[in-house]
């Protein structure tokens, strides 16, 4: 988990599909009641921006203490600031909660850069703009941290929505969503619509603007266009998926598909960028550079260090290619593709001294821990985390940023053989060899 890249770390038109579309079987199967339709009370319940994370309002304790909590599908702890910190406007005060229970256990979470540590306990938790339920959940009360909280981000904690396998200190600490499903009738599914602004937001604009929606327990039709296409969750730890092909402006990168998933591919709302394994990153950048060769940008731009600026309103989106990721489908030998625009992978940033320029950072970066489909990917799509059926759905987001010529797309089906071979099997430590 890297700070600045991984947070903390860590109106759309549907595209016409190429090839034959399955008869909407991925979108119209019978579902459990309450999982589909309108969730008005949860729409627009997220705020924030891709560079600093999207957060939801939650309440903790009795009487309820209101906090803004980063929505993170790349971790599994519910952890909140519980001591004064220069970047926190407010924090969880356990001593004021009559329902707080101390678990008498510490937790320490180091990142590549930075860390947080705290004390474990449980308390009553609810989501004001979520399902009308209260659950007793595990909470890590953060007492010390380094490079975790972000100045001006307006969130005070993190909601890890992934599986128990990656919870700290170990998988016996039940994650929040597991507790929610176990203690209520909320279906085992949530969906995210992250809405990138397409331009930099200052502090007051972030507070006033809508950042998107987290629909807990269902799917809201108003948040997407076209069909939902599902990819299997390969293993329940991170939200791990399998990428089977990558194209830049329709040109296949032609790599062994194992490279795309080395050592895993995950969907992570707590990461800003699309992060790619070294070899894949180098090939992708080479291809993007070639496609946009009418302009020469500094090497530092492609490494995420330098900005590129145009005079306001003159960004030549058309010189940058679209990027397509093909994901394993639910049917044998069938895949589908999700396509993002430069409006997703060029991240708008505030210029240091002038509002005359539109400036951008290249939001694709190199990874040593596999592919991370972060906010820049998710901002193009409505993403359904269907835990009950062990699958993740993608549809074109109704709020994705695009222009009059191109739109993000989710298209299929495509015939792809031997997709199972694209998954990388991380070597498991043989416990017996440690017993010497």
């Amino acid at each position: 988990t890297q700070h600045g890249i991984r947070l903390p770390l860590r109106s759309g038109l549907g595209g016409a599909p190429l090839g034959l579309r399955l008869p909407r079987e991925t979108d119209e199967e019978p579902e459990e009641p309450g999982r589909r339709g309108s969730f008005v009370e949860m729409v627009d319940n997220l705020r924030g921006k891709s560079g600093q994370g999207y957060y939801v309002e939650m309440t903790v304790g009795s009487p309820p203490q209101t906090l803004n909590i980063l929505v993170d599908t790349g971790s599994s702890n519910f952890a909140v600031g519980a001591a004064p910190h220069p970047f926190l406007h407010r924090y969880y005060q356990r001593q004021l909660s009559s329902t707080y229970r101390d678990l008498r256990k510490g937790v320490y979470v180091p990142y590549t850069q930075g860390k947080w540590e705290g004390e474990l306990g449980t308390d009553l938790v609810s989501i004001p703009h979520g399902p009308n339920v209260t659950v007793r959940a595990n909470i890590a009360a953060i007492t010390e941290s380094d490079k975790f909280f972000i100045n001006g981000s307006n969130w005070e904690g993190i909601l890890g929505l992934a599986y128990a396998e990656i919870a700290r200190p170990d998988d016996s600490l039940e994650p929040f969503f597991d507790s929610l499903v176990k203690q209520t009738h909320v279906p085992n599914l949530f969906s995210l619509q992250l809405c990138g602004a397409g331009f930099p937001l200052n502090q007051s604009e972030v507070l006033a603007s809508v950042g998107g929606s987290m629909i807990i327990g269902g799917i809201d039709h108003s948040l997407y266009t076209g069909s939902l296409w599902y990819t299997p969750i390969r293993r329940e730890w991170y939200y791990e998926v399998i990428i089977v092909r990558v194209e830049i402006n329709g040109q296949d990168l032609k790599m062994d598909c194992k490279e795309y998933n080395y050592d895993k591919s995950i969907v992570d709302s707590g990461t800003t960028n699309l992060r790619l394994p070294k070899k894949v990153f180098e090939a992708a950048v080479k291809s993007i550079k070639a496609a946009s060769s009418t302009e020469k940008f500094p090497d530092g731009f492609w490494l995420g260090e330098q900005l590129v600026c145009w005079q306001a309103g003159t960004t030549p989106w058309n010189i940058f290619p679209v990027i397509s990721l093909y994901l394993m489908g639910e049917v044998t030998n069938q895949s589908f593709r999700i396509t993002i625009l430069p409006q997703q992978y060029l991240r708008p940033v505030e210029d240091v001294a002038t509002s005359q320029d539109d400036c951008y950072k290249f939001a694709i970066s190199q990874s040593s821990t596999g592919t991370v489909m972060g906010a820049v990917i998710m901002e193009g799509f409505y993403v359904v985390f269907d835990r009950a059926r062990k699958r993740i759905g993608f549809a074109v987001s109704a709020c994705h940023v695009h222009d009059e010529f191109r739109t993000a797309a989710v298209e299929g089906p495509f015939v792809t053989l031997d997709m199972e071979d694209c998954g990388y099997n991380i070597p498991q430590t043989d416990e017996s060899t440690l017993m010497t």
């Epitope: 940008f297 500094p298 530092g300 600026c309 240091v352």
Partner: nanobody
């Protein structure tokens, strides 16, 4: 407008050292990104080092890593960047240019080359065998 002036070039024997300097004035932003480039006769210009003031980081081309080091001085509204070149080889012979981006941003409409808006005149480095 950022002004760049290189100095320190010359002729040196293989294995010898030279120190180039680039004085930059006229920055409008606190942060800056600068690059050292070189161009040998009949070859394309290549970046040999780049400096990012915000990150306090320097990157080097593989061909010079371990032999060239860059450092910087900030005084009196002028930034001076140095390129210390050790263990020089005949293939290091080229015109060396200093380039800069104000605010660590390449402003496309200002023009420039190789992703930099501002360029010095260049200084000749010749390494004889």
């Amino acid at each position: 407008q950022v002004q760049l002036q290189e100095s320190g070039g010359g002729t040196v024997q293989a294995g010898g050292s030279l120190r180039l300097s680039c004085a930059a004035s006229g920055y409008t932003y606190r942060s800056y990104c600068m690059g050292w480039f070189r161009q040998a006769p009949g070859k394309e210009r290549e970046e040999v080092a780049s400096i990012n003031s915000d990150q306090g980081s320097t990157r080097y081309a593989a061909s010079v890593k371990g032999r060239f080091t860059s450092s910087q001085d900030n005084a009196n509204n002028t930034v001076t960047v140095y390129l210390q070149m050790n263990s020089l080889k005949p293939e290091d012979t080229a015109i060396y240019y200093c380039a800069a981006n104000d605010g660590c941003a390449y402003r496309v409409y200002r023009g420039g080359a190789y992703g930099y808006n501002f360029w010095g005149q260049g200084t000749q480095v010749t390494v004889s065998s």
